[in-house]
């Protein structure tokens, strides 16, 4: 299927110009290769009219021009003084030859219809009102005022001063005086509809005397705006249908064959097909709401209409906007998965993407929820805090320049299942939709932290692990200190060249983290996860509340009683003989216990087990404080 | 960041007027949609109105509807909140919000200004 998308009809009169929009996928090549605009002969065959490359044929000449917006991948084929000749079928395309990424654009011309000469025109949209105008003389101010509508032979009755009403008309039709000015009435018709275009008379007085006067009213449908979007991107309908209408149900409709089909409306009604991916936004002080679809499917594309109607549904009669939306599939949005699932207890990396060439845009993320017109709370983003109900388990990461921001979501319950929204303050065609399915767990954590009840004594070393599983031997590790604003990722150090191990006993990885020595501020969330470069993985999370200590425990002076609290992260392979209290069991904060840093030994455990005590508790300890000797000399 | 000041605050009688300003800089200003909200003394911070980024579309409170008027000017960063008919109940400090957002997803403000105070005697 051809990326290029334009106008399928285009409808002028003699004498009158046409501007024809065309659009090509943003991709380089297309921005600066040949456009052009030929007419389709009987063979088959394209005959150029005009090109970017500067040819203008003879029936072209001075009435007619290609420009290439860059900028907006668009170019426009403008041309003047339309003739009858010029109907016919036409291809506005991209390549070197007429045989390239082409669409096609039929241009029909018709004839100026001949009116009588003294006709006023009246041009409105179908739902609108009209007002005729209708002049007379002072002595026809106390005859009957009528307006007729002219059918073949004769002139039936819309309505007049004596309150008769053709019934198709009765109330949308109203006669009326202004004021004091008897040389003037008035007809008002409303909720127009393509029934009531055609040639009018409107007539003051009776016989030869009577005034008259000839109205032509053209009732047009709306011309579609065209809107072209890139798969998995996403579109906004802004619908903008006056005041008169602002207090009425709205909705949004895609035309299938000769119904249009409600997506959604302002009464609750939605389509199932755009569940999780569509919201109607609240109405403007004028009456004006706009419907957002995100995730946008190659079956999104099609026409559709915005409206406004007490029934929520589309009525004739009633103003309407419409779209012809085309869905690009050679789209710039990178493929990712639609669906993530994770497991009760569990946590879940998203990976967001944003247009990369906004990477200083303010990055969000938003659950959609159906109720009513459907809304997206945000959740978390750059500047926003996160929501209260997510405190501890939610934070946005933002990687500079990636194209990419990742969301981690942990502590899952199945609450958390449903749609959420990937959003920035930039470029609105990259807004994306994720499914998150919560199964429940079937078997124990990859990550768990010990001790899972956490409670830290002020002034004292507190140490907490995290234990993984081999899979994660490779990835980097790391404990971050969770706050509304985000994880902040502590510092780690890696000794020396990481180690590989030969054998992975599946019980024995973990990863420490020391608060030493502890202070009130390290109270809070702490997480713990894995990452590859900037590809994050699985976390999990731990509350650790700071206490005073009570009387008679035993604490470890710090050598700085204003260093802030000690933080070190060890990474050991643990002998499986030793338990994990008699692993912890003698807090050894070293020589440098006041350094504010995490210390990432990496797998250089597995030679110190192999040299050290590892039979006894005491053992490890030395061997894990003679690594930080080593490391700062 | 976004630095937002607001001025134009003061005291005014009941049925008086005032026009309230508010002056961004840092990043571009077109990128935000714009909102006033007041905070009376012991109650929450409400929303009066709001504005798109392109300033097409306006947002009020129903307390503030035909009274107030919001309105932008991106050329030069500011933001206006034209108040009519003040009535003693509109006493609050009134603050102005940057939002990344427009209104699609619910106006919550990603940077706020000082506030500046109004007070409407009877």
């Known amino acids: 299927k051809s990326p290029i998308f334009g106008p399928q009809e285009v409808s002028s009169i003699e004498g009158d110009s046409v501007s024809i929009t065309c659009y090509y996928p943003d991709t380089s090549v297309n921005r600066h290769t040949r456009k052009y605009w030929c007419r389709q002969g009987a063979s088959g065959m394209c005959t150029t009219l005009i090109s970017s490359n500067g040819y203008l044929s003879k029936e072209y000449s001075g009435r007619a021009n290609l420009i290439n917006f860059p900028e907006n991948n668009t170019f426009v084929i403008n041309i003047e003084q339309l003739t009858q000749d010029d109907t016919g079928s036409y291809k506005c395309g991209l390549g070197t030859s007429n045989r390239g990424l082409s669409f096609d654009v039929s241009l029909e011309v018709s004839q100026v219809p001949e009116l009588p000469s003294d006709t006023h025109v009246y041009t409105k949209d179908i739902g609108r009102n009209v007002t005729i105008e209708c002049p007379f003389k002072r002595e026809n101010a106390p005859s009957k005022k009528s307006l007729c509508k002219k059918t073949n032979q004769s002139c039936e009755l819309v309505i007049d001063s004596t309150e008769k009403v053709n019934p198709s008309y009765i109330g949308r039709a109203k006669l009326f005086m202004k004021g004091t000015d008897l040389t003037v009435f008035y007809v008002n018709i409303s909720h127009l509809t393509h029934n009531d275009a055609g040639l009018y008379i409107c007539q003051a007085g009776e016989g030869p005397s009577a005034d008259k006067k000839n109205v032509d009213l053209q009732v047009l449908a709306p011309e579609p705006e065209l809107l072209y979007k890139d798969l998995r991107s996403s579109v906004t309908f802004e619908c903008d249908l006056g005041r008169e209408v602002a207090n009425e149900a709205k909705y949004l409709c895609r035309m299938n064959k000769e119904t249009c089909d409600v997506i959604i409306n302002t009464l609750g009604k939605r389509d199932p097909d755009f569940e999780g991916r569509i919201l109607i936004t609240p109405k403007d002080d004028n009456g004006r709401f706009s419907v957002l679809i995100t995730g946008l499917r190659k079956e999104d594309a099609g026409h559709y209409q915005c409206g406004a109607h007490s029934s929520g549904l589309p009525q004739e009669g009633w103003p309407i906007q419409t779209w012809q939306l085309f869905v690009n599939e050679e789209s710039t949005i990178p493929n990712r998965r639609s669906v993530v699932k994770g497991v009760t207890g569990g946590s879940v990396a998203i990976a967001c993407p944003y247009n990369p060439k906004e990477s200083s845009s303010l990055k969000y993320w938003c659950r959609w929820e159906g109720d009513g017109n459907g809304h997206c709370p945000v959740l978390v983003g750059t500047q926003a805090q996160v929501q209260e109900e997510y405190e501890g388990r939610l934070a946005l990461f933002d990687q500079p320049g990636n194209g990419t921001y990742t969301v981690i979501l942990n502590q899952l319950t199945t609450e958390d299942a449903g749609f959420y929204w990937c959003l920035t303050n930039g470029d609105s065609r990259w807004r994306t939709t994720i499914e998150l399915q919560v199964a429940e767990a079937t078997r124990e954590p990859n990550l768990e932290v010990t001790p899972q009840n956490a409670t830290a004594v002020l002034g004292e070393t507190f140490t907490v692990s995290c234990h993984y599983p081999c899979k994660f031997y490779s990835q980097e590790k790391y404990w971050c200190k969770w706050s509304n604003k985000g994880c902040h990722i502590l510092p780690s150090h890696d000794e020396g060249a990481r180690q590989s191990s030969v054998s992975c006993d599946q019980s024995s990885q973990l990863v420490s983290m020391t608060l030493n020595p502890v202070s009130k501020e390290d109270e809070g969330w702490y997480w713990c996860g894995v990452k590859q470069g900037q590809t994050y993985g699985e976390t999990t999370a731990i509350y650790i509340a700071v206490e005073e200590r009570t009387r008679g425990s035993s604490h470890v002076n710090p050598t700085d009683a204003n260093a802030r609290a000690k933080v070190a992260l060890e990474e050991e392979v643990v002998d499986s003989s030793i338990s994990e209290k008699e692993n912890k069991a003698i807090p050894n904060p070293g020589p440098f216990a006041n350094e504010r840093e995490i210390q990432n030994v990496g797998d250089q455990a597995q030679e110190n087990r192999a040299s050290g005590d590892a039979g006894s508790a005491d053992g490890q300890s030395r061997s894990s404080s003679s690594k930080h000797h080593h490391h700062h000399h | 960041e976004v630095q937002l000041v607001e001025s134009g605050g003061g005291s005014v009688q009941a049925g008086g007027s005032l026009r309230l300003s508010c002056a961004a800089s840092?990043?571009?200003?077109?990128?935000?949609?714009m909102g006033w909200f007041r905070q009376a003394p012991g109650k929450e911070r409400e929303f009066v109105a709001g504005i798109s980024r392109s300033g097409g579309s306006t947002y009020s409170a129903d307390s503030v509807k035909g009274r107030f008027t919001i309105s932008r000017d991106n050329a030069k960063n500011t933001v206006y909140l034209q108040m009519n008919s003040l009535k003693p109940e509109d006493t609050a400090v009134y603050y102005c919000?940057?939002?990344?957002?427009?209104?699609?997803?619910?106006?919550?403000?990603?940077?706020w200004g000082q506030g500046t105070q109004v007070t409407v005697s009877s």
């Open positions: 840092g990043r571009t200003f077109s990128n935000y949609a």
């Open positions: 919000a940057a939002d990344g957002l427009d209104y699609a997803l619910g106006f919550r403000g990603d940077y």
